[in-house]
């Protein structure tokens, strides 16, 4: 019995050198959230602790900027940031909610290509 | 196919401890949803603590309000093993406890939906 519902920026593409702002938004549910975690598959990006704030993981302190909000800005992209991202919310008293985004980083190249032409 | 095995319940006077363990085959998602359940006698099941854990390092504990500050839920990865401390046991903590594993990690906590199940010790706390 599910109480609350995790939406999400679901599957996404961006420019490589780009930024992108990962998205989550628990709704549903009146519990109170106390830290959300964002993590790249099986790697710990931030954390964000209702009452410590913000902790940015030392490894993507340089490419990695909070917010807006609960989100996360990915700067700099490259294309090995193509993959799977989570949001992990906890909250009281209801448990753990997990949203998952793919995102996707095109060449340059690539995404100008795609916006110029069609295949018909 | 997954498996769950639990142990470690017994007869216990009120205010002592016991801990018990779920050791689970078949369970190797790199993210895990598991907790402990219990029934009480003539009573429906209640959830007591669920553990989500991922292999990129988060790890969230939930409680049910009765048990909160008395029961820690842990894990054993090398041994693939889920806990529950109890202390200060209570006449009405008296019930088969039961581990419970889930497939989807959307929701973890004491009122999800579980798709496996132990069979389940018995712990009766009594003078």
């Known amino acids: 019995m599910m109480t609350g519902t995790i939406e999400t920026t679901g599957n996404i593409s961006a420019e490589k050198g780009g930024s992108i702002i990962l998205q989550c938004h628990l709704s549903s549910t009146t519990a109170q959230v106390t830290q959300v975690n964002w993590e790249q598959q099986d790697q710990l990006l931030a954390i964000c602790n209702a009452d410590l704030g913000w902790h940015i993981s030392p490894s993507f302190k340089d490419r990695v900027a909070p917010g807006p909000g609960l989100g996360l800005t990915l700067q700099s992209l490259t294309v090995n940031d193509t993959g799977e991202y989570f949001c992990i919310y906890h909250t009281y008293p209801d448990g753990t909610y997990t949203g998952r985004i793919f995102l996707e980083v095109l060449e340059s190249s690539v995404a100008e290509h795609g916006a110029r032409f069609q295949i018909p | 196919e997954v498996q769950l095995v639990e142990s470690g319940g017994g007869l216990v006077q009120p205010g002592g401890s016991l801990r018990l363990s779920c050791a689970a085959s078949?369970?190797?998602?790199?993210?895990?949803?598991r907790g402990w359940f219990r029934q009480a006698p003539g009573k429906g099941l209640e959830g007591v603590s669920t553990?989500?854990?991922?292999?990129?390092?988060?790890?969230?504990?939930t409680y049910a309000d009765s048990v909160r500050g008395r029961f820690t839920i842990s894990r054993d990865n090398s041994k693939n093993t889920l806990y529950l401390q109890m202390n200060s046991l209570r006449a009405e903590d008296t019930a088969v406890y039961y581990c419970?594993?889930?497939?989807?990690?959307?929701?973890?906590?004491?009122?999800?939906?579980?798709?496996?199940w132990g069979q389940g010790t018995l712990v009766t706390v009594s003078s």
């Open positions: 419970a594993a889930r497939l989807s990690t959307d929701f973890c906590g004491p009122r999800a939906d579980f798709d496996y």
């Open positions: 078949g369970y190797t998602y790199s993210r895990k949803c």
């Open positions: 553990l989500y854990t991922s292999s990129g390092g988060t790890y969230f504990d």
